[in-house]
């Protein structure tokens, strides 16, 4: 790397992946191993994030970009940039302070995360229950009883279930 020659700040010419080394007369030096600078003109390189414990490396650190972590099997990411990992549960369960618990009757969870949610109330839309709900699945609403008179043909599609509840990420 050559010494920069900017009249204003000699460090401004140091590209990403380098730092302006005051100990070497403001020469642009490459970031040391396990560190990075994502923008130019940096006077230091930042230490890379370390994916340890429950975290595993999703993307290795490079001289210009930080490492990215995700969670080991059995856990899913929470927080900005996956700063925490939360235990997975089975479908039909929700996570409580005492661990994974089955959904109560009348509720379901079709994911490994989030909370159990009430079955859709078909009667609110004037429909009837076509398929009963389970711990893992919402009910399927069918045509209203009036629509089941002789001659009625097509089955109306089920009312869309509410958005699944996601843990913050």
């Amino acid at each position: 790397f050559e010494r920069t020659r900017s009249l204003q700040d000699p460090c401004s010419n140091c590209p990403a992946g380098t730092f302006c080394d005051n100990n070497r007369n403001q020469i642009c030096s490459p970031c040391p191993p396990n560190s990075f600078s994502s923008a130019g003109g940096q006077r230091t390189c930042d230490i890379c994030r370390q994916c340890k414990g429950v975290f595993r490396t999703r993307k290795e650190c490079s001289s210009t970009s930080n490492a990215e972590c995700d969670c080991t099997p059995g856990f899913h990411c929470l927080g900005a940039g996956c700063s925490m990992c939360e235990q997975d549960c089975k479908q039909g369960q929700e996570l409580t302070k005492k661990g994974c618990k089955d959904c109560c009757f009348g509720t379901f969870n079709d994911q490994k995360r989030g909370i159990c949610r009430p079955w859709t109330n078909c009667s609110l839309d004037g429909k009837s229950v076509l398929v009963n709900g389970t711990k893992e699945r919402d009910v399927v609403c069918g045509p209203s009883p009036a629509d089941l008179s002789p001659g009625a043909s097509s089955v109306t599609p089920p009312a869309p279930a509410r958005e699944p509840g996601h843990s913050p990420q």
Epitope: G53, G79, A80
Partner: antibody
Framework: EVQLVESGGGLVQPGGSLRLSCAAS??????????VAWIRQAPGKGLEWVSS????????YYADSVKGRFTISRDNSKNTLYLQLNSLRAEDTAVYYC???????????????WGQGTLVTVSS | DIQLTQSPSSLSASVGDRVTITCQAS??????LAWYQQKPGKAPKLLIY???NRATGIPSRFSGSGSGTDFTLTISSLQPEDFATYYC????????FGQGTKVEIK
């Protein structure tokens, strides 16, 4: 309920060795992702992280001050964590705590569970 | 390595006071910061994790904020049982603790 109980501390001469144990209950040390650590506190001083071992892949980590002298390990069958202390120095005198990462069902790089500590005194 | 600098190193306060302790990291650590309380002869106790999440059973008077390099622990109304030493800790790269802040009775 998560519990950590340390033992093995005592008086040892400079240059000597000691093995600390931490018996874990309420969780499995071999569970993927559950990291455990040793953290020490010299008399009247602050907390200093010493060493960690991850539950996933058994990767080990050491503070520069103990690297090459201390060894962290675990016995999954006994659900016990160990710290082997060799070439001990006066500055290693401290209460040594065993701690588990995370809290409840959320894991991360913090310590939600701590043992009561065991005192190591290095003196001639 | 990443250094954490706590300030003040000690403070005197009265019951009912609002107390603020700061922790500055030597580089950006996003939200990889926790706060602990330690009383003499006892093990540290987790108060806050991921910069702002209160640990289970911790009273709401304790709150954490900040991201990047500057973090704050606030006790909104100091109680008699809150006189202790408080530590910040980062887990972004390895693990390091701040030097501690002792909260004493005025």
């Amino acid at each position: 309920e998560v519990q950590l109980v340390e033992s093995g501390g005592g008086l040892v001469q400079p240059g000597g060795s000691l093995r600390l144990s931490c018996a874990a209950s309420g969780f499995s040390l071999s569970t993927g992702g559950v990291g455990v650590a040793w953290i020490r506190q010299a008399p009247g001083k602050g907390l200093e992280w010493v060493s960690s071992i991850s539950g996933y892949g058994s990767t080990t980590y050491y503070a520069d001050s103990v690297k090459g002298r201390f060894t962290i390990s675990r016995d999954n069958s006994k659900n016990t964590l160990y710290l082997q202390l060799n070439s001990l120095r006066a500055e290693d005198t401290a209460v040594y705590y065993c701690a588990r990462e995370g809290s409840d069902a959320v894991l991360g790089d913090w310590f939600g569970y701590w043992g009561q500590g065991t005192l190591v005194t290095v003196s001639s | 390595d990443i250094q954490l600098t706590q300030s003040p190193s000690s403070l005197s306060a009265s019951v009912g006071d609002r107390v603020t302790i700061t922790c500055q990291a030597s580089q950006d650590i996003t939200t990889y910061l926790a706060w602990y309380q330690q009383k003499p002869g006892k093990a540290p106790k987790l108060l806050i994790y991921d910069a702002s999440n209160r640990a289970t059973g911790i009273p709401s008077r304790f709150s954490g904020s900040g991201s990047g390099t500057d973090f704050t622990l606030t006790i909104s109304s100091l109680q008699p049982e809150d006189f202790a030493t408080y530590y910040c800790q980062q887990g972004y790269y390895l693990w390091t603790f701040g030097q501690g802040t002792k909260v004493e009775i005025k």
